[in-house]
């Protein structure tokens, strides 16, 4: 009985249920392709349970295998808009520590206005994920069109 | 020993493993943009473990953070077909209770025939999810082309 | 105390946390539409924890409901490339045992160069998943552009 009670009182984070869902805050200055994210109940339906934001980039707090997912929609976009510009590409990767820098997920907008994907990947405590949008088109800040999240799956 | 046995005998639903995967049943009448879903082993590979269907819409039975995913393919579609019609958009949202109404996920078919995406979002017991397909193109009913599901991730 | 220790010493696989993320190894010979996958830490960020590879195809080791996800990008592709060829389609399905053969997930590249999707589906021990790419375009082997994975979700 005492064991069951103790188990119930453990914080969820100790069970490894780290999870985050972020919404777009802003794009970077001209030479910075990174998207800057924000999260928290005050902002709507975004949240961080475990991971943290470091200058708009997502930092992992627990080692494990994560499901990383993202959707980015270009602002005021039609297939005509998309086809009239140089290819726009989104890449999600570990950007720090530099020793672990790697691209995890990459997609191009080919005459389309939205990309969406997901993948499983091992992440370590301290890994910071960056989402780089290359091209000159502005992403939508609508929370149902552009979002980025991670979910801890197993050690 | 008794504790371990008791734990094994708990129904899975009490562990919070609510999950559902649905297949398209039919579209609504002309002025109703909602897609109507169905699920159950008799229908193939669709199922509901926890959530329920209410007139073809998915109702949540357990509070928590959920992974919501969807794929919709337009019927007898080619990029030519898609480009000949006005933009078709899919939106997944909470449609009831009205006080919690919000769009969670939105994608347009831009000269494409399939949209697919997923996101993490908090849902509460009693939330009903609706999937609205605006535009005049009929979605495919093939179970490997059009489907909609949720998975409970954490409290 | 002894119970807690025993619990910690159980292998993760016994908790049902089967998971795999694979990278493309090669395509099949001309009349074989299957993609052949590989996985393991020596190859980068791919891994198999529970499921196994059988001649480049993914074999399931534990009954349950799985989240299956995939992304495939066509090599040296632009929307022009994609539109100039016969439709290229990706299908993920159970290919053996033959008695359980079924298509689970199907997407076409319509003037696009990448498809990405995911779904929940029941899988049984011994099910082998095949990913068939029909058409004459070569998929990218970049690990951030083409990948395939499964995650055990619940019994």
């Amino acid at each position: 009985q005492r064991f069951a009670q103790a188990q119930q009182q453990l914080p969820l984070e100790s069970l490894g249920w780290d999870v985050a869902e972020l919404q777009l805050n802003h794009t970077g200055p001209q030479q910075d392709p990174r998207l800057y994210w924000q999260g928290g109940p005050a902002l709507g339906r975004s949240f961080l349970h475990g991971p943290e934001l470091d200058k708009g980039q997502l930092r992992i707090h627990r080692d494990g295998i994560y499901m990383v997912h993202i959707q980015v929609t270009l602002a005021i976009c039609s297939s005509t808009t998309a086809s009239r510009h140089h290819p726009t590409t989104l890449a999600v990767g570990i950007c720090s520590p530099a020793s672990r820098s790697i691209s995890l997920l990459r997609l191009s907008f080919h005459q389309g206005c939205t990309i969406a994907s997901q993948r499983l990947t091992p992440l370590a405590r301290g890994d910071t994920l960056c989402t780089n949008l290359t091209g000159t088109l502005l992403p939508s800040r609508n929370t149902d069109e552009t979002f980025f999240g991670v979910q801890w799956v197993r050690p | 020993q008794r504790f371990a046995q008791a734990q094994q005998q708990l129904p899975l639903e009490s562990l919070g493993w609510d999950v559902a995967e649905l297949q398209l049943n039919h579209t609504g009448p002309q002025q109703d943009p909602r897609l109507y879903w169905q699920g159950g082993p008799a229908l193939g590979r669709s199922f509901l473990h926890g959530p329920e269907l209410d007139k073809g819409q998915l109702r949540i039975h357990r509070d928590g953070i959920y992974m919501v995913h969807i794929q919709v393919t337009l019927a007898i579609c080619s990029s030519t077909t898609a480009s000949r019609h006005h933009p078709t958009t899919l939106a997944v949202g909470i449609c009831s209770p009205a006080s919690r109404s919000i769009s969670l996920l939105r994608l347009s078919f831009h000269q494409g025939c399939t949209i697919a995406s997923q996101r993490l979002t908090p849902l509460a017991r009693g939330d009903t999810l609706c999937t609205n397909l605006t535009g005049t193109l009929l979605p495919s009913r093939n179970t490997d082309e059009t489907f909609f599901g949720v998975q409970w991730v954490r409290p | 105390q002894r119970f807690a220790q025993a619990q910690q010493q159980l292998p993760l696989e016994s908790l049902g946390w089967d998971v795999a993320e694979l990278q493309l190894n090669h395509t099949g010979p001309q009349q074989d539409p299957r993609l052949y996958w590989q996985g393991g830490p020596a190859l980068g960020r791919s891994f198999l924890h529970g499921p196994e590879l059988d001649k480049g195809q993914l074999r399931i080791h534990r009954d349950g409901i799985y989240m299956v996800h995939i992304q495939v990008t066509l090599a040296i592709c632009s929307s022009t490339t994609a539109s100039r060829h016969h439709p290229t389609t990706l299908a993920v399905g159970i290919c053996s045992p033959a008695s359980r053969s079924i298509s689970l997930l199907r997407l076409s590249f319509h003037q696009g160069c990448t498809i990405a999707s995911q779904r929940l589906t029941p899988l049984a021990r011994g099910d082998t998943l095949c990913t068939n790419l029909t058409g004459t375009l070569l998929p990218s082997r970049n690990t951030d552009e083409t990948f395939f994975g499964v995650q055990w979700v619940r019994p």
């Epitope: - | 535009g135 005049t136 082309e145 | -």
Partner: antibody
Framework: QVQLQQSGPGLVQPSQSLSITCTVS????????VHWFRQSPGQGLEWLGV???????DFNAAFISRLNINKDSSKSQIFFKMISLQPNDTAIYYC??????????????WGQGTSVTVSS | DIVLTQSPTSLAVSLGQRATISCRAS??????????MHWYQQKPGQPPKLLIY???NLESGVPARFSGSGSETDFTLNIHPVEEGDAATYYC?????????FGAGTKLELK
């Protein structure tokens, strides 16, 4: 209520062109596609072409070089033109509204038909 | 192009009896979970009237005496019980792809 009203000549000289106007009411041409057909004793019902809600057109390959369809959505009118008519083009010509679903291609309302005779 | 073959070319049925008309396509018109076959009724001097869409769905306002069935390449229109106003020519039409094509028609007469 939904209506499609056709107007056009009954007699056309060989090698001349045929113009028919289909004026619609009860629905918008920015939402619905309109197809064109003809019916003759020899050929039965033939699909000629379609103008989609977006203004894009598709034609039967057998008529593509002789056919043009355009519209003025603000006036609820579709204009059908076929050139170089021959006696075997004698038929009743119909416009028909595509049902609500753009990829269904079933006609839920039809014009009354324009009987065309090609003769000198 | 998909060729539709209707049979019979004509039939005579007594009031209250069943009329059955067949339509065979030269290739499958089933796709995306639907059967892209429709049925029309045409009376002399009038345009065709949609009766059944997607093989088995009754168009609004059409009596339930009309029913359709079939899939892939073989489709059937049933009228039961036949009434006086049903004397007409019936056409099948596919919409699996462009160009749309019609069957040659089946003329239903009342005995």
């Amino acid at each position: 209520q939904v209506q499609l009203q056709q107007s056009g000549p009954g007699l056309v000289q060989p090698s001349q062109s045929l113009s028919i106007t289909c004026t619609v009411s009860g629905f918008s041409l920015t939402t619905y596609a309109v197809h064109w057909f003809r019916q003759s004793p020899g050929q039965g019902l033939e699909w000629l072409g379609v103008i989609w809600s977006t203004g894009i057109t598709d034609f039967n390959a057998a008529f593509i070089s002789r056919l043009n369809i355009n519209k003025d959505s603000s006036k609820s009118q579709i204009f059908f033109k076929m050139i170089s008519l021959q006696p075997n083009d004698t038929a009743i010509y119909y416009c028909g509204r595509n049902s609500y679903y753009g990829n269904l291609y079933a006609m839920d309302y039809w014009g009354q038909g324009t009987s065309v005779t090609v003769s000198s | 192009d998909i060729v539709l073959t209707q049979s019979p070319t004509s039939l005579a049925v007594s009031l209250g009896q069943r009329a059955t008309i067949s339509c065979r396509a030269s290739k499958s018109v089933s796709a995306s979970g639907y059967n892209f076959m429709h049925w029309y009724q045409q009376k002399p001097g009038q345009p065709p009237k949609l009766l059944i869409y997607l093989a088995s769905n009754l168009e609004s306002g059409v009596p339930a005496r009309f029913s359709g069935s079939g899939s892939e390449t073989d489709f059937t229109l049933n009228i039961h019980p036949v009434e006086e106003g049903d004397a007409a020519t019936y056409y099948c039409q596919h919409s699996r792809e462009l160009p749309l094509t019609f069957g040659a028609g089946t003329k239903l007469e009342l005995k």
